[in-house]
Interface confidence: low
């Protein structure tokens, strides 16, 4: 036997391996060591060393391959911005110490998105979000240059791509390349450059993982039914083919160790409990692995959707089960997942293409046998028809989360395996199992109510109200004056949001009829609440016959609505439900939601109109960029406004403007559409941004919508972001979680 192979394990001398200003600990039975530095410091030039077969420790080499005699703890710096487009940052410095701040501002004509001020944190990362200066000129908004990265590409047209790079020695996490997609979103996920000493804090992981996971859960399509909503939770009843499968994959190799394995089990128990709190009943698959995988729970088992039973199976798994086979064969483990996903005789069962698959992999490091596991991810994507059709990539049907635990984690490998989705993080690197347990503890402790707003159950035989479950029809009967028809939107179990001008002060509650869900019966009204600043006659003296500023009202119902497939709330801006619907982190501010929903550009939106007794969605563009001024100026063509000298007298900052022929010929609203929601459809969710108020041209004379309308036919809607204090006050008891 060669001498190198006969050497006992862990026989490298510890002489001279000390680190100046810190300490070290041995890993893998003395086969590796990790340098540990105090908070705010990092080990230079490397964090870990391995014991080589020659009996010496791996060399201390810097990122540019220079050899160093002794390791030392150095102060953590945050990277400087290599580039900042269309603006300036200050102060400029070659590096930044912990607690240093930088601030960003944009050149004229550009709007800042993200964080204007950022602080260098103790883990070497900047606080807040990437600062971006954008003028809204592209089809997609500027994707930005996360600090520390370099971006190639500055065209943001449909299907344009940008690529990102890191400086030598840093590892790119996230997407190296992002492509501008239909609908204005970027493919993949925002990149960042990671140094080996960087870890995600438990709070960061809990926030990012939870934000992404709730989106996956809330996006589950229930094809065949959904029971009435329980208090604060919507139960999603899975169709027979199962709408969601979660595969828990746990590394049980010898490098993990018994206590870490127990810790990982605790994490997964917490996760199962968390998912159950959403009222979702996914099927679970459970795999542990070392040299070989072991399947403990198959998704095909009858009890795989019983959270208690799955938890019991998980608790009974013993670390010793993999004792004699201690390699790390991640590929084989993922092949076990693939085997659970695939179907006998290659014949897909009914509904297979509506099932979402979530893989959660916990590992302490490198796969050291079996080959590259990425090939299995490719096979899984192939099996599920993901990424194969440019028009319908089906990316929503697979989420792969990878939790890397400890210093030996190979960041490149775990990043390659994890999914990459816009505004989401699927790859996490935590310091140790204690930190990971903390992640799942924080996550389980998060106890916001989960009202799934803006959800639409798509049915083969779905009615209009399955597709628009928030839509309310309002009519006001006025003796000897006929009746007024309006629309509204269900925003909570007791409230419908509509336009104030649908009512007069003389209208009695009993003369107001509200129906939802396509039901024949009318709902009893407790009270109509007008915005206090609404006054249609407010500018009569100034020669303005009708003034629609603050044209919003809330109808309070006497009885609580019973949510179901055809009655559900729409999402309101600056609420927790909208944060989740948009897959934003829980720390998202109202301003960040506004930037997401109403960026300074043409925004694709829709309203719902009734034509020949059918509800139809009409696609329009909110002119919020360079076309905003011309859109608002067309208000002068409205009857009674021709003498208005300054159009801002009638078009106040409360209004959003749609209509006209650019970028596309927008359909116009009709009288009966007033009070209905102006909606942004994002990530399969519907968020109300406006209330339909008034139009320049009556395009629906004689109950028929005219085909040819003038270019100045514009519509004006109350911007909900502008009436938030009132909404927040009136809806404070509705558990909407206003930000």
């Amino acid at each position: 036997t060669p001498w190198s192979l006969a050497r006992p394990q862990g026989s490298c001398s510890l002489e001279g391996v000390e680190i100046k200003g810190g300490s070290f600990r041995l890993l893998q039975e003395g086969q590796a060591l990790e340098y540990v530095c105090p908070s705010g410091f990092y080990p230079y030039p490397v964090q870990t060393r391995t014991c080589r077969s020659t009996g010496s420790w791996s060399t201390l080499k810097t990122q540019d391959q220079k050899t160093v005699r002794k390791a030392e703890c150095r102060a953590i710096h945050c990277p400087r911005p290599h580039d900042f487009e269309n603006g300036e940052y200050w102060p400029r410095s070659p590096y930044y110490n912990v607690s240093d701040e930088i601030s960003f501002h944009c050149y004229d004509g550009y709007t800042l998105r993200g964080s204007a001020n950022r602080t260098c944190q103790v883990n070497g990362r900047w606080s807040g979000q990437t600062a971006i200066c954008d003028n809204g000129a592209g089809y997609c908004s500027n994707p930005g240059i996360p600090i520390g990265t370099r971006k190639v590409g500055s065209q943001y047209r449909l299907e344009d791509s940008v690529t990102y790079h890191c400086s030598r020695g840093l590892t790119l996490r996230g997407s190296q390349r992002r492509t501008c997609q239909e609908g204005g979103s970027w493919s993949g996920t925002e990149p960042s450059c990671q140094d080996s000493f960087m870890y995600d804090t438990p709070q960061e992981v809990a926030e990012a993982f939870l934000s992404s996971l709730t989106e996956t859960i809330e996006g589950v399509d229930a094809e065949d039914g959904h029971g009435p909503g329980e208090q604060q939770k919507r139960k999603i009843v899975l169709d027979p083919s199962g709408s969601m499968n979660i595969y828990l994959v746990l590394d049980g190799s010898d490098s993990i160790g018994a206590s870490n394995f127990t810790g990982a089990k605790k994490c997964l128990v917490n996760l199962i409990e968390k998912v159950a709190s959403y009222g979702v009943k996914p099927r679970y698959g459970l795999v542990t692995y070392a040299t070989y995988p072991k399947i403990w729970v198959k998704v095909s088992e009858a009890d795989s959707s019983n959270a208690d039973w799955v938890t019991k199976q998980l608790n009974e798994i013993n670390y010793e089960d993999h004792k004699l086979k201690s390699g790390t064969n991640t590929k084989k483990a993922l092949q076990a997942v693939y085997s659970m996903m695939s179907w006998p005789d290659d014949v897909p069962p009914e509904g297979w293409n509506r099932t979402r698959h979530v893989i959660i992999l916990m590992t302490d490091g490198l796969h050291n046998m079996g080959g590259d596991p990425i090939t299995v991810i490719d096979e899984i994507r192939d099996l599920l028809y993901i990424g194969k059709d440019r028009k319908n990539p089906r990316e929503d049907y697979l989420d792969v989360y990878v939790f890397g635990v400890g210093p030996l984690v190979n960041q490149v490998n775990i990043n390659a395996l994890a999914s990459k989705k816009d505004n989401e993080q699927h790859v996490f690197k935590v310091k140790d199992m204690e930190n990971l347990e903390d992640v799942f503890y924080q996550m389980i402790d998060e106890s916001q109510s989960l009202s799934l707003c803006g959800m639409v159950w798509e049915h083969r035989k779905g009615t209009d109200y399955h597709k628009q479950p928030w839509q309310a029809k309002i009519s006001v009967i006025r003796p000897s004056k006929g009746h007024e028809s309006c629309m509204g939107a269900v925003v909570s179990e007791y409230f419908v949001l509509t336009a104030a001008h649908c009512f007069t002060v003389d209208d009695k509650e009993h003369s107001i009829k509200v129906s939802v869900g396509g039901e024949k019966r009318d709902l009893e009204i407790e009270v109509v609440l007008f915005h206090p600043n609404y006054n249609i006659n407010g500018k009569k003296e100034a020669g303005i016959p009708e003034f629609y500023d603050y044209d919003v009202a809330l109808i309070k119902l006497k009885n609580k609505l019973k949510y179901g497939q055809t009655i559900r709330p729409i999402c309101l801006p600056c609420t927790e439900g909208t944060t989740r619907a948009l897959r934003l982190p829980p720390t998202t501010t109202c301003q960040q939601q506004k930037e997401e929903l109403l960026p300074a550009q043409d925004i694709k939106a829709l309203f719902v109109s009734e034509e020949e007794k059918k509800l139809t969605r009409k696609e329009v563009y909110i002119k919020n960029g360079d076309k905003k001024g011309s859109c608002e100026r067309d208000a002068q063509y409205a009857p009674g406004y021709d003498k208005v000298k300054d159009i801002s007298e009638v078009v106040t900052p409360r209004f959003l403007c749609t209509g006209g022929v650019s970028p596309y010929a927008d359909p116009n609203t009709c009288r009966g559409d007033s009070g209905g929601p102006l909606i942004v459809h994002k990530r399969s969710r519907f968020i109300q941004v406006g209330v339909i108020s008034w139009g320049v041209v009556d395009v629906c004379k004689n109950q028929k919508r005219q085909k040819q309308v003038p270019a100045h036919a514009r519509d004006f809607h109350i911007n909900l972001f502008q009436v938030l204090p009132w909404l927040k006050e009136k809806l404070q008891d509705e558990d909407l979680g206003f930000l």
Epitope: E159, S161, D346, D378, R381, D382, K388, D389, R390, K391
Partner: antibody, heavy 119, light 110 residues
Framework: EVQLLESGGGLVQPGGSLRLSCAAS????????MNWVRQAPGKGLEWVAT????????YYADSVKGRFTISRDNSKNTLYLQMNSLRAEDTAVYYC????????????WGQGTLVTVSS | QSVLTQPPSASGTPGQRVTISCTGS????????VNWYQQLPGTAPKLLIY???QRPSGVPDRFSGSKSGTSASLAISGLRSEDEADYYC???????????FGGGTKLTVL
């Protein structure tokens, strides 16, 4: 063994029509987008058309748009190219090629079938 | 006329290293992965490199691909007589919304 076998080529007069077929075997045909690529005598490769795995989306080169139609029958594991209003410049060897999953490239090619447009 | 430029010919002696270039624009090579094909005389093309630098199984590691900016190149080291063939580069082109091929390079092993 993964195989693509083209047929249907031959001599046709300008303005005439021809239908090429490509029989697939050895893989799950319905999971792959498919392409037609041609090569005029002594010239380079020219992409002609692509059809998505389910047949719902079709893409054509400008030179054949409106004249050629790509289609597929997943139950028969067969790809088709219907060529109408043929011109002399359409003379070429026509290859059918399978598109890879994760790149706009072609990982399996047929042996080709010659189409000659001449009076 | 192809939107991608390849030298019409290249040559080398056995054992030598040769490089074939392919120049495009931001709408094709600049923003998309490049694939390379080998076409031996009288046969159908064969995929040689995909996604700029990945080799399908069965392709010797003498063949390697790279990309920088709006150019890509194929390198063949340890040239052999059986490498004599036509080589084509192929990215996707965003502005044409289609696959595009380079004009092809005829490699002669002297």
């Amino acid at each position: 063994e993964v195989q693509l076998l083209e047929s249907g080529g031959g001599l046709v007069q300008p303005g005439g029509s021809l239908r090429l077929s490509c029989a697939a075997s050895g893989f799950t045909f319905s999971k792959h987008s498919m392409n037609w690529v041609r090569q005029a005598p002594g010239k380079g490769l020219e992409w002609v058309a692509t059809v998505s795995y389910d047949g719902n989306y079709k893409y054509y080169a400008d030179s054949v748009k409106g004249r050629f139609t790509i289609s597929r029958d997943n139950s028969k594991n067969t790809l088709y190219l219907q060529m109408n209003s043929l011109r002399a410049e359409d003379t070429a060897v026509y290859y059918c090629a399978r598109e890879g999953y994760y790149y706009y490239g072609m990982d399996v090619w047929g042996q080709g079938t010659l189409v000659t447009v001449s009076s | 006329q192809s939107v991608l430029t390849q030298p019409p010919s290249a040559s080398g002696t056995p054992g030598q290293r040769v490089t074939i270039s392919c120049t495009g624009s931001s709408s094709n090579i600049g923003n998309n992965a490049v694939n390379w094909y080998q076409q031996l005389p009288g046969t159908a093309p064969k995929l040689l490199i995909y996604n700029n630098n990945q080799r399908p199984s069965g392709v010797p590691d003498r063949f390697s691909g790279s990309k920088s900016g709006t150019s890509a190149s194929l390198a063949i080291s340890g040239l052999r007589s059986e490498d004599e063939a036509d080589y084509y580069c192929q990215p996707y082109d965003d502005s044409l919304s289609s696959v595009v091929f380079g004009g092809g390079t005829k490699l002669t092993v002297l």
